[in-house]
């Protein structure tokens, strides 16, 4: 039939509320151009009647609400004067109950689903709300694991939930509700978001930061006992492991028989706007075999290593 | 509508102080972070201060840091930069934004002019 | 202190064309980048936050990618009223800094 076809990724959508999907290809859909939408290859159209549960509304495609049995393979046809481009859409809804299930549980979810908050910023949610114009939003509320959203911290505009000064508690399932009205009639959107916090960001560069060990080697006697401090500045509400490893191995499970290397109790001391932390590694007694091996100090993804290295020989003694 | 009306400007000799003000309307004020950018007259902008939405935090670059002091007043929608020890480079444009998120400066004031010169 | 270089400073385009600028960060800024015109005689507008969000009713052939240290500022189809000045800013770090500036002018 001489249609160009396109293929649109999976939409993972929530059953019994509102869903709206516009057809648009940019360089196809800003001329001239008539939109047609069908299901499953069905040679008819889906009804521009605006009664109807599921209709056409201008380029979108419009389920008031979503069912169950709605999930498959969306077309709309884009024709233009001398083109004709076929857009698959895969839709698949899904039962979710936001205060009932975990969201991990969820296949696949889209990134307006998953959302990412920035360790000590300012930052925000979006609430996506995808619907063509003949849908009225009334005023977005927002739910943290089912409880309404209050605090000097949040502050909601437009469609966004802002967070000052994000801290790791911020984590967790968030929703976001919102009223919307069509041909008179109320359908209630829940968007439910699963909010991780990143910690690349504060009071500099990315975090956390190694002080020391800088990659550097120590000159150390045979059979001498050595501490070695590993130096972290880190944000406040960081959720960071600091330890020590070798080969691949946390110190205290390496040498879990000898104990002759062990790794010492964390300490922090307070700044304005960071923590500085530090962890030793002791060496009861240096042997042979840990002169040349990197000793690494891990901070979340930073990591830098000490190197043992005999002394250079003295040759005034002579 | 939010408005941002800043004051305050003025010419100044080096070593002089000023004190400008910013007064806001059509927003919740104490919601918000709030910064003073300015532009130099080689339309170069340069970010000057920023204090967090409840006072508790206030940010500046070595360059201003000593002599300018940002502050605000919630109660009267207000924000202010007191600024000491001016030098000719601190000639600039000197306009107050509201922070939305970390950067995002989305409402500007219309800025007020310094001129430091002897 | 984080140095933010914005290239080019002047860009000569024609009318419907789509033009790229962009901002290199000398240290990783994560997607703190922030992008705004200036009109002469008017105030800065921002456009773009967190690198890639477009701000409300801030026209869809303007948008922005990039993370880390190298971010491109887009517009595609260029008319009339954006040839103008445009600024990046990096927030990840203080002090935060503006790129130098990009001046666009008609081919």
């Known amino acids: 039939d001489g249609c160009n076809d396109i293929f649109m990724k999976n939409e993972m959508l929530s059953a019994s509320q509102p869903f709206a999907f516009n057809c648009t290809f940019p360089p196809i859909t800003s001329g001239e151009v008539s939109v047609t939408w069908y299901k499953n290859s069905s040679k008819i159209p889906v009804s521009k009647i605006i009664q109807s549960r599921i209709h056409q509304d201008e380029t979108w495609i419009l389920f008031l609400p979503m069912e169950w049995g709605d999930s498959g393979v969306y077309q709309c046809v884009i024709k233009g004067r001398d083109s004709c481009h076929r857009i698959h859409v895969n839709l698949t809804v899904f039962e979710k109950q936001w205060c009932d299930t975990s969201v991990k549980g969820l296949p696949n979810l889209s990134d307006e689903y998953k959302q990412i908050l920035h360790l000590g910023k300012d930052d925000s949610l979006t609430c996506h709300l995808h619907f063509p114009k003949s849908c009225i939003l009334g005023p977005i509320k927002w739910y943290k694991d089912c409880n309404e959203i209050t605090g000097e911290r949040f502050t909601v505009l437009e469609t966004r939930l802002l967070v000052s000064n994000v801290s790791a508690e911020d984590r967790g399932n968030y929703a976001c509700q919102v009223i919307l009205t069509h041909s008179g009639k109320q359908y209630e959107v829940l968007n439910g978001i699963t909010v991780s916090i990143t910690e690349r960001a504060g009071y500099g560069g990315s975090v956390p930061k190694i002080i020391y060990p800088k990659n550097n080697s120590i000159e150390v006697q045979l059979g001498t006992t050595l501490i070695v401090d590993c130096n972290i500045t880190d944000t406040k509400d960081n959720t960071n492991l600091r330890c020590w490893r070798v080969n691949n191995t946390l110190v205290d499970d390496y040498y879990n028989e000898s104990k002759r290397i062990r790794e010492g109790v964390e300490t922090h001391a307070s700044f304005r706007e960071y923590n500085l932390y530090t962890v030793n590694i002791t060496f009861l007694e240096v042997k042979m075999e840990d002169y040349g091996l990197p000793f690494m100090c891990h901070a979340g993804v930073s990591a830098a290593y000490i190197m043992l290295q005999l002394p250079a020989p003295d040759f005034r003694a002579y | 509508e939010v408005m941002l009306v800043e004051s305050g400007g003025g010419l100044v000799k080096p070593g002089g102080s000023l004190k400008l003000s910013c007064a806001a309307s059509?927003?919740?004020?104490?919601?918000?972070?709030m910064s003073w950018i300015r532009q130099t007259p080689e339309k170069r902008l340069e970010w000057v201060a920023t204090?967090?939405?409840?006072?508790?935090?206030?940010y500046y670059p070595d360059s201003v840091k000593g002599r300018f002091t940002i502050s605000r007043d919630n109660a009267n929608n207000t924000l202010y930069l007191q600024m000491r020890s001016l030098r000719s480079e601190d000639t600039a444009m000197y306009y107050c934004?509201?922070?939305?998120?970390?950067?995002?400066?989305?409402?500007w004031g219309q800025g007020t002019l310094v001129t430091v010169s002897a | 202190e984080i140095k933010m270089t914005q290239s080019p400073s002047s860009l000569s385009a024609s009318l419907g064309d789509t033009i790229t600028i962009t901002c290199r960060a000398s240290?990783?800024?994560?997607?703190?980048l922030t992008w705004y015109q200036q009109k002469p005689g008017n105030i800065p507008k921002l456009l773009i936050y967190?690198?890639?969000n477009l701000h409300t009713g801030v026209p869809p052939r303007f948008s922005g990618s990039g993370s880390g240290t190298d971010f491109t500022f887009t517009i595609s189809s260029l008319q009339p009223e954006d040839i103008t000045t445009y600024y990046c800013?990096?927030?990840?770090?203080?002090?935060?800094?503006f790129g130098g500036g990009t001046k666009l002018e008609i081919k």
């Open positions: 934004a509201i922070m939305i998120t970390t950067g995002e400066h989305a409402y």
């Open positions: 059509g927003i919740t004020f104490s919601r918000f972070a």
């Open positions: 204090i967090s939405s409840g006072d508790m935090y206030t």
């Open positions: 240290q990783d800024i994560s997607v703190w």
């Open positions: 967190k690198a890639s």
């Open positions: 800013l990096q927030s990840q770090s203080y002090p935060w800094t």
